[in-house]
Amino acid sequence: AVNGTSRFTCFYNSRANISCVWSQDGALQDTSCQVHAWPDRRRWNQTCELLPVSQASWACNLILGTPDSQKLTAVDIVTLRVMCREGVRWRMMAIQDFKPFENLRLMAPISLQVVHVETHRCNISWKISQASHYFERHLEFEARTLSPGHTWEEAPLMTLKQKQEWICLETLTPDTQYEFQVRVKPLQGEFTTWSPWSQPLAFRTKPAALGKDT
């Protein structure tokens, strides 16, 4: 939802968290603001306190329940409002009718581990976190490997077009330190975006055997 120079963007992690960012040019930093969530067909509502993340933007997380509980479904619509205190009153600054499963951003993959490493290849696995069972296998992943002397931005993206929670990295250099990251995205949702990148996993390929061609 955008009002002039105001922007209010929220994502659902598919289970029990809605994360919101509100930005407004010229807003006072010390103003007390909240996000209110009112589902259209549930008995609960939820509020979180917006905290500054930059000069003109605030963020907060609506915690709807325990991390793995399915608090919203595919047919829920949640009215989200930004409310700011003006003296003794609250003023509505932004509003949107939020369809959770059209605005998904999953949690970053976790539990990255090296399954097997050789001189030229490395097999890595991971797990998805707090992802709804609704998706079945309809998820995709992007992965990238940081090579020595390069930046993450330079790393080519590898795409896995199915729910595959492992990858075999090939054509690596022996006895070399690498880092690896992965992120996940459901196919569902018009405004769905990639999860954050996972924490990097550092690994080292095995040295080449002495006296052998590599």
């Epitope: 399915q70 595919a74 047919v75 069972h133 609704y134 079945e136």
Partner: antibody, heavy 117, light 107 residues
Framework: EVQLVQSGAEVKKPGATVKISCKVS????????IHWVQQAPGKGLEWMGW????????EYAPGFQDRVTITADTSTDTAYMELSSLRSEDTAVYYC??????????WGQGTTVTVSS | EIVMTQSPATLSVSPGERATLSCRAS??????LHWYQQKPGQAPRLLII???QSISGIPARFSGSRSGTEFTLTISSLQSEDFAVYYC?????????FGQGTKLEIK
């Protein structure tokens, strides 16, 4: 192999209730959604509703919500659809299916229900 | 309730030729459109999800596309086993609704 096996054909009188079963195998029933779809001769395919087995939550289409009840028995990996106050236009093939909320990945073989006096 | 309109109701095509089936939504549904195939006496089978994503195990000759509220299922080179009824289904607004179907028959 994913399988959904439905109970056999039924003949019912108007006003009666029918209960169809859907026994599943080849996947984790507790982490699934089981849907029911009606295919009546003149009306095409109509989504009746679903049950989220894990949460125990149901969602019914407005056209059926007054008369349909969907349940699940996790001890037998079986879902049920009960349709009450039957009328002649409920004569149809009823399918159970597994999928996320948005589309149906695997289907049962269908159960024919005939409503006739 | 969103109304899904499929056209034509019946399509006659020769084996080996291309078939193009259309599905139009009565309002904007983003890419929340899925295609099924149903043969006589059988349950429907899922072919394409989200307008254009093929389901694993479905032959590559089946493809989907979207232009606004109009969706197209294309079968590039018809095989004998492709003659069936095809349904589209929206999942944008509950209740999800199906089109009335297009019967693809041998010319």
């Amino acid at each position: 192999e994913v399988q959904l096996v439905q109970s056999g054909a039924e003949v019912k009188k108007p006003g009666a209730t029918v209960k169809i079963s859907c026994k599943v195998s080849g996947f984790n029933f507790k982490e699934s959604l089981i849907h029911w779809v009606q295919q009546a001769p003149g009306k095409g395919l109509e989504w009746m509703g679903w049950i989220d087995v894990e949460a125990g939550e149901t969602e019914y289409a407005p056209g059926f919500q007054d008369r349909v009840t969907i349940t699940a028995d996790t001890s037998t990996d079986t879902a049920y659809m009960e349709l009450s106050s039957l009328r002649s236009e409920d004569t149809a093939v009823y399918y159970c299916a597994r999928g996320g909320p948005w589309f149906l990945s695997y289907w049962g073989q269908g159960t024919t229900v005939t409503v006739s006096s | 309730e969103i109304v899904m309109t499929q056209s034509p109701a019946t399509l006659s095509v020769s084996p080996g030729e291309r078939a193009t089936l259309s599905c139009r939504a009565s309002q904007i549904i983003s890419n929340n459109l899925h295609w099924y195939q149903q043969k006589p006496g059988q349950a429907p089978r899922l072919l394409i999800i989200y307008g254009l994503q093929s389901i694993s195990g479905i032959p590559a000759r089946f493809s989907g596309s979207r232009s606004g509220t109009e969706f197209t299922l294309t079968i590039s080179s018809l095989q004998s086993e492709d003659f069936a009824v095809y349904y589209c289904q929206q999942s944008n607004n509950w209740p999800w609704t199906f089109g009335q179907g297009t019967k693809l028959e041998i010319k």
